[in-house]
């Protein structure tokens, strides 16, 4: 339905508070280097303008698109060229090219200082004295560091952030109450950001069809009692929501997400028996809850899939008449029967089935040709099953830290050209799969493991895209979304790699190592491990294990010494020499 003023429409739909928060997130995700105060100023100007349009939709400029209004506002920033370089050239373009230009300049790894958490009392004072500013600062800091964060979900996180401070700043032991909550929010936020980054990459790099296919698989697993028409409706609406958010259309995205939540709650009976609790919650919690709802129970009387998709004489006719609908139905039917499969596996099976039909439907005896198509699925299913079994065994054997090290060695040997910080970050995240998934019951393991790995490998892909250094990474990242994980798994040691020259500075450590948190110490050690592998790519796991044990002993010894710095200076070069010998 057409509105005279889009900005007035969204302001009225969302309400002033959410409108302002979403505009702040949008601006922070576009201009990631701008100071907080500058963004607040821009947001207030936009909000005042929106109010004039609510009062009179025919007022000057109120008929302009949101992209035009927001783009014009961003282009008023005085220091645009100094701060952002060629992003300033976007302002010379017309919409929609200008918005596309801004999107292309979003930086997944902006050069921003790490967020330092102030003392609890300092945070509580700031929260109590300037609650609104404090919460808006949270939105700003998260949004600028995560330019693809799912905006309506970020508002939910801000609400949880507020609740944590409201509760804990009144507690007897503020720190004991607040810090675990903030840690949990930080971890959940990073996970949410990474998941959304995969959705945006899927849409932007592989198109709407790829995203819709993934959504059909997931929605069908969640709502196995819903019929195909209902699943299609939810998937279409969900695709619109994510397309908008990934495209920077955050007001439309949040508005449409609320509409979808409303629809789902009004149609619970035909979707899932698991929505009741979610639908009793207020908007932000409701949408979050619906997005994370558990799978409904499978209907008892599901027919054999082979009837319609293998044994039917009409397979080729149905496929030819409406390929996308037919494949959508296949994916829906297969997915609702297999909550135990990862979404990526389900998409691979659909791809294999489609390839078989393409081949067989052109033959004289199509049925004879595709009669055994489901048997061909077996190796595709066994591959992630083996992956889960093997990696969970390793995780249980080693524990998270040593499992991360195992993966770090594996991936450094596969793609040694990738920067060490990226290899460490990605391997640490890959290693967390064990903690997250290996304790799950058998039926939940594969979807947990493989779909989580897809999220983490997408982080590698987006970081690598910024500064491409490895053709192998580029190939795995760009050829096929659904085959990314198998592509990386299949990579062997890169035999073409020339070992990195030894740099003593890389392996020189100081007393400051002792004051680092456990996590920071691990990162330091893992950085050294990756550099060691780059220097000696032919080193065996046993050799590397010995060196790492010696290194851990060296750190422990020197951190116990009276003169720590002297110990590091004296023992460090000895360790390096011994390691060189051990790895010769």
């Amino acid at each position: 339905d057409a509105h005279k003023s889009e900005v007035a429409h969204r302001f009225k739909d969302l309400g002033e508070e959410h409108f302002k928060d979403l505009v702040l997130v949008a601006f922070s995700q576009y201009l990631q280097q701008c100071p907080f105060e500058e963004h607040l100023k821009l947001v207030n100007e936009v909000t005042e303008f929106a109010k004039t349009c609510v009062a009179d939709e025919t007022a000057e400029n109120c008929d302009k698109s949101l992209h035009t209004l927001f783009g014009d506002k961003l282009c008023t920033v005085a220091t645009l060229r100094e701060t952002y370089g060629d992003m300033a050239d976007c302002c010379a373009k017309q919409e929609p090219e200008r918005n596309e230009c801004f999107l292309q300049h979003k930086d997944d790894k902006p050069d921003l200082p790490p967020l330092v958490r102030p003392e609890v009392d300092v945070m509580c004072t700031a929260f109590q004295e300037h609650e609104d500013t404090f919460l808006k600062k949270y939105l700003y800091e998260v949004a600028r560091r995560h330019p693809y964060f799912y905006a309506p979900e970020l508002l939910f996180f801000a609400q949880k952030y507020k609740a944590a401070f409201t509760e804990c700043c009144q507690a007897a032991d503020k720190g004991a109450c607040l810090l675990p909550k903030l840690d949990e929010l930080r971890d959940q936020g990073k996970a949410s950001s990474a998941k959304q980054r995969l959705k945006c990459a899927s849409l932007q790099k592989f198109g709407e069809r790829a995203f819709k296919a993934w959504s059909v698989a997931r929605v069908s697993q969640r709502f196995p009692k819903a019929d195909f028409t209902e699943v299609t409706k939810v998937v279409t609406d969900l695709t619109k929501v994510h397309t908008e958010c990934c495209h920077g259309d955050l007001l439309e995205c949040a508005d449409d997400r609320a509409e979808l939540a409303k629809y789902m709650c009004e149609n619970q009976d035909s979707l899932s028996s698991k929505l009741k609790e979610c639908c009793e919650k207020p908007l932000l919690e409701k949408s979050h809850c619906l997005a994370h709802v558990e799978n409904d129970e499978m209907p008892a009387d599901l027919h054999a899939l082979t009837d319609d998709y293998v044994e039917s004489k009409d397979v080729c006719k149905n496929y030819a008449e409406a390929k996308d609908v037919f494949m959508g139905m296949f994916l829906y039917e297969y997915s609702r029967r297999h909550p135990d499969y990862s979404a990526m596996l389900l998409l691979r099976l659909a791809k294999a089935y489609e390839a078989t039909l393409e081949k067989c439907c052109a033959t004289a005896d199509p049925h004879g040709c595709y009669a055994k198509v489901f048997d061909e699925f077996q190796p595709l299913v066994e591959d992630p099953q083996n992956l889960v079994k093997h990696n969970c065994e390793l995780f249980e054997q080693f524990g998270e830290y040593k499992f991360q090290n195992e993966l770090l060695v594996r991936y450094t040997k596969k793609v040694p050209q990738v920067s060490t910080p990226t290899l460490v970050e990605v391997s640490r995240n890959l290693g967390k799969v064990g903690t997250k998934c290996c304790k799950q019951p058998e039926a939940k393991r594969m979807p947990c493991v493989e779909d989580y790995l897809s999220v983490v490998l997408n982080q590698l892909c987006v970081l690598h895209e910024k500064t491409p250094v490895s053709d192998r990474v580029t190939k795995c990242c760009t050829e096929s979304l659904v085959n990314r994980r198998p592509c990386f798994s299949a990579l062997e040691v890169d035999e073409t790699y020339l070992p990195k020259a030894f740099n003593a500075e890389t392996f020189t450590f100081h007393a400051d190592m002792c004051t680092l948190s456990e996590k920071e110490q691990q990162v330091k050690k893992q950085t050294a491990l990756a550099e060691l592998v780059k220097h000696k790519p032919k080193a065996t796991n046993e050799q590397l294990k010995t060196v790492m044990e010696d290194f851990a002993a060296f750190v422990e010894k020197c951190c116990k010494a009276d003169d720590k710095e002297a110990c590091f200076a004296e023992e460090g070069p000895k360790l390096v020499a011994a390691s060189e010998t051990a790895l010769a």
Epitope: A304, D307, D308, S312, K313, D314, M329
Partner: antibody, heavy 121, light 111 residues
Framework: EVQLVESGGGLVQPGGSLRLSCAAS????????MGWVRQAPGKGLEYIGI???????YYASWAKGRFTISRDNSKNTVYLQMNSLRAEDTATYFC???????????????WGQGTLVTVSS | DIQMTQSPSSLSASVGDRVTITCQSS????????LSWYQQKPGQPPKLLIY???DLASGVPSRFSGSGSGTDFTLTISSLQPEDFATYYC???????????FGGGTKLTVL
């Protein structure tokens, strides 16, 4: 007892619509394709169409557009929606269970007793 | 549209006779054998006798048999019994489920 029972027939004016139901008992409809066949008074059998277990529908060329078959597995019922009815649609309408699940083999091994539809002004 | 032609359209015979009814399709049936035979008595729904050209449906006496392939098929009743007087229909399945078709019927009466 395994049986199919049609209902919804009756007198309808030309141009009118009617929805016939076919309720199954003693077995689950989700395991077989279900077809509709009609028989004008004193005439032979005429195939209307079929719905597969997965919901794929297939219609005789003359029925396409006017007739729609659907199923509700939770109610164990198949439906035939008939629109723009004409005098020549007067017949007994049977629902029948095909031997196959995904298509029409022409071998219907379980039939309902039929419901009479009369189109007349 | 695909035509199914049954002959004869009517037939009189006596108890104990051997009776043959033929069915011809304008196109080959699916897999060359997707043809069924039905028996219908007044006021009753049809009853499946034969499927896949020659397979006897459950509970059907062995005096009924079917044969044929492609476009030409035959239903044989080896020794007619009093309860066999009825109308018989053939039905063919073709490469598309939309094309399933019945023959015009053969009315078998007492001579």
């Amino acid at each position: 007892e395994v049986q199919l029972v049609e209902s919804g027939g009756g007198l309808v004016q030309p141009g009118g619509s009617l929805r016939l139901s076919c309720a199954a008992s003693g077995f689950s409809l989700s395991s077989n394709a279900m077809g509709w066949v009609r028989q004008a008074p004193g005439k032979g059998l005429e195939y209307i169409g079929i719905i597969s277990v997965g919901g794929f529908t297939y219609y005789a060329s003359w029925a396409k557009g006017r007739f729609t078959i659907s199923r509700d597995n939770s109610k164990n019922t198949v439906y035939l929606q008939m629109n723009s009815l004409r005098a020549e649609d007067t017949a007994t309408y049977f629902c029948a269970r095909d031997r196959h699940g995904g298509d029409s083999s022409g071998a219907f091994y379980l039939w309902g007793q039929g419901t009479l539809v009369t189109v007349s002004s | 549209d695909i035509q199914m032609t049954q002959s004869p359209s009517s037939l009189s015979a006596s108890v104990g006779d051997r009776v043959t009814i033929t069915c011809q399709s304008s196109e080959s049936v699916y897999s060359n054998n997707q043809l069924s035979w039905y028996q219908q008595k007044p006021g009753q729904p049809p009853k499946l006798l034969i499927y896949d050209a020659s397979d006897l449906a459950s509970g059907v006496p062995s005096r009924f048999s079917g044969s044929g392939s492609g476009t030409d098929f035959t239903l044989t009743i080896s020794s007619l019994q009093p309860e066999d007087f009825a109308t018989y229909y053939c039905a063919g399945g073709f490469s598309s489920s939309s094309d399933t078709a019945f023959g015009g019927g053969t009315k078998l009466t007492v001579l």
